[in-house]
Amino acid sequence: VLEVYYTSLRCRCVQESSVFIPRRFIDRIQILPRGNGCPRKEIIVWKKNKSIVCVDPQAEWIQRMMEVLRKRSSSTLPVPVFKRKIP
């Protein structure tokens, strides 16, 4: 559910939201670390309804959710890290 992507392209998010999204509506969370053309960390939430939302990394709910997911994944498998170029 938690993915970290390293890209060599500019920022993906134009607008960010802080609105809480219940976990049961979320398919996966994509994290784009800052650097490589984008000065900020970006978080993209892919919802089960096939829509996509850019979430403000400072939003309390997403920080807490990532903390929970990291704890869960560290007790089972490490957080998957994918290197990929986005066209």
Epitope: V19, F20, R23, F25, K48, N49, S51, E60, W61
Partner: antibody, heavy 120, light 107 residues
Amino acid sequence: EVKLLQSGGGLVQPGGSLKLSCAASGIDFSRYWMSWVRRAPGKGLEWIGEINPDSSTINYAPSLKDKFIISRDNAKNTLYLQMSKVRSEDTALYYCARQDDYDYYAMDYWGQGTSVTVSS
Amino acid sequence: DIVMTQSHKFMSTSVGDRVSITCKASQDVSTGVAWYQQKPGQSPKLLIYSASYRYTGVPDRFTGSGSRTDFTFTISSVQTEDPAVYYCHQYYTIPLTFGAGTELELK
């Protein structure tokens, strides 16, 4: 204009069954999660359960999952609540609501409510 | 289940007053809280979602705040149309739960 028109309420005997309906118009019904909520006389709102767009996920309040069944027919734009083994404490006003999962993530549209009275 | 506790069942106020309704969650619900208004003979209406966001068309005298376990709903200047029962609601996790409601009446 979004409308959720409820029907099927009425008087039912203890131990009996009843099926409530909620017909949606003005929305793409097949895209949305839907919930049932009730309000018993003199009490607050109580969530019964919810169903996702393709009926593959149905969540219930633990205390109610053995007596209520939530279903939907997207071709008819209609949500259902099948009530069975009803008791006096099931007497309430029953509401259907749209559970938005695009912008608000809360119940943003509600039906007008339908009354269920359990009595012999 | 997460219990949502609204400290007051009834609150009495006057037109023009500022009134705050509090709600406490039995465990951390982040900002997964909404506030509803229900008037007699009407269905509940969504006022606030994600703890502090005003729903479309809701007057700006209604505000919400809080996170984790403590939440507050405020009407900055009570109007004659505001008497109703106000419910807090957590949608952080299943089962979804509501507070018992706070009935706001005019003196």
